[in-house]
């Protein structure tokens, strides 16, 4: 005999599980339909009636097939140091990421919970490791023969210009000054810039403290409880 297609709700066979997009309702002891993303279970199934689903209300969402009694609340609006990279819809939560010049000091499941400004290396120090979405800039002292005269999160240490005749020798925070005769070799004018990190999705990385840097100010964002996972098995 050909196998019959069971319509929800139905009693699963011994040792079997419910099919894709179904869940086992422990109260009804039946396989029942899940609700699609953007919906939630308004009425749970019984032995004689399937799950009744309803759309999520404004500012709430479900991202997965589910049987949650209420949709999850979207996260709070992005703070001033963040940009909204994904809007709150019925099917997805709002995602906030750090704006340019900032990095994620404390990530959450999606997006960033706490942004902090990228460290600026003061004169005499250059960028050893550039900032990323999730890590701060690392500064290093300019080695002999190099300098940085800026307070910057992107400038590296540059070689001193080489003079035929040196008027003022260079140091870690100042280029060499040549006499009026042209130098034999010089760097192109202007600071050398590293590319800014582009903030998208972030992971948690502790910022590396550097004693030789300007202080970094952090702004704490409101932290609510993480939303419950949709899925598994419910009443």
């Amino acid at each position: 005999l050909p196998a019959q297609v069971a319509f929800t709700p139905y009693a699963p066979e011994p040792g079997s599980t419910c099919r894709l997009r179904e869940y086992y309702d422990q109260t009804a002891q039946m396989c029942c339909s899940k609700c699609s993303p953007g919906q939630h279970a308004k009425v749970f199934c019984t032995k004689t009636s399937d799950t009744v689903c309803d759309s999520c209300e404004d500012s709430t969402y479900t991202q997965l097939w589910n049987w949650v009694p209420e949709c999850l609340s979207c996260g709070s609006r992005c703070s001033s140091d963040q940009v909204e990279t994904q809007a709150c819809t019925r099917e997805q939560n709002r995602i906030c990421t750090c704006r340019p010049g900032w990095y994620c000091a404390l990530s959450k499941q999606e997006g960033c919970r706490l942004c902090a400004p990228l460290r600026k290396c003061r004169p005499g120090f250059g960028v050893a490791r550039p900032g990323t979405e999730t890590s701060d800039v690392v500064c290093k002292p300019c080695a002999p023969g190099t300098f940085s005269n800026t307070t910057s999160s992107t400038d590296i240490c540059r070689p001193h210009q080489i003079c035929n005749v040196v008027a003022i020798p260079g140091n870690a925070s100042m280029d060499a000054v040549c006499t009026s005769t042209s130098p034999t070799r010089s760097m192109a004018p202007g600071a050398v810039h590293l590319p800014q990190p582009v903030s998208t999705r972030s992971q948690h990385t502790q910022p590396t403290p550097e004693p030789s840097t300007a202080p970094s100010t952090s702004f704490l964002l409101p932290m609510g409880p993480s939303p419950p996972a949709e899925g598994s098995t419910g009443d």
């Epitope: 709700p9 139905y10 009693a11 699963p12 011994p14 040792g15 599980t17 086992y24 422990q26 109260t27 002891q29 039946m30 032995k47 004689t48 598994s232 098995t233 419910g234 009443d235």
Partner: antibody
């Protein structure tokens, strides 16, 4: 395959407490509820109620409220039945049974209450 | 609560003969096209063993001499040709609504 393994026999004095365990294997523990069934010596089967293994919410049958407590440790896929203030009439074999309409059963735990 | 009344209380049948056990429910146990009536065999010192589920479906590994029939309130377990190892107590159980209830049991012996 589905297996429910219960703790061993217990001999208790009246007024004492007992905790029976039921360890599940061969399926996802939090998918199916767990029922408890009592069988007094020479008697039939009596359903005591069940616990939702996903939410942890217990549901007690009439006559099994108060002294009877269902609990879980999902980290070890185990359900528990605790009976307090034991009486001689609590002497019985206690079975755990997976709640899936028809039941898969543990081997049973004999609890004897005697002074 | 749904009351299940099993008959007879005990039954003595010759080896190779048919054994029939009845179970009557105080209200229907049918829903969604299924009969939520199940049959178990219990031997001394052992837990009940599922034989028939949802009225008439034979559990895997159970000999096909066992069969179940009926609907709504009246159900029957039949052993077509009794074997020595079938000596046991047989219970019906309903799961259409809580509380789960069991019949009082039927003891099957060899005549």
């Amino acid at each position: 395959q589905v297996q429910l393994v219960q703790s061993g026999s217990e001999l208790k004095k009246p007024g004492a407490s007992v905790k029976v365990s039921c360890k599940a294997s061969g399926y996802t523990f939090t998918t199916f509820g767990m029922s408890w069934v009592r069988q007094a010596p020479g008697q039939g089967l009596e359903w005591m109620g069940w616990i939702n293994t996903y939410s942890g919410v217990p549901h007690y049958a009439q006559g099994f409220t108060g002294r009877f407590v269902f609990s879980l440790d999902t980290s070890v896929s185990t359900a528990y039945l605790q009976i307090s203030s034991l009486k001689a009439e609590d002497t019985a074999v206690y079975f755990c049974a997976r709640r899936s309409n028809f039941a898969y059963w543990g081997q049973g735990t004999l609890v004897t209450v005697s002074s | 609560d749904i009351v299940l009344t099993q008959s007879p209380d005990s039954l003595a049948v010759s080896l190779g003969e048919r054994a029939t056990i009845n179970c009557r429910a105080s209200q229907t146990v049918d829903s969604s096209g299924n009969s939520f009536m199940h049959w178990y065999q219990q031997k001394p010192g052992q837990p009940p063993k599922l034989l028939i589920y949802l009225g008439n479906r034979l559990e895997s590994g159970v000999p096909d001499r066992f069969s179940g029939s009926g609907s709504r309130t009246d159900f029957t377990l039949t052993i077509s040709s009794l074997q020595a190892e079938d000596v046991a107590v047989y219970y019906c159980q309903q799961s259409n609504e809580d509380p789960w209830t069991f019949g009082g049991g039927t003891k099957v012996e060899i005549k």
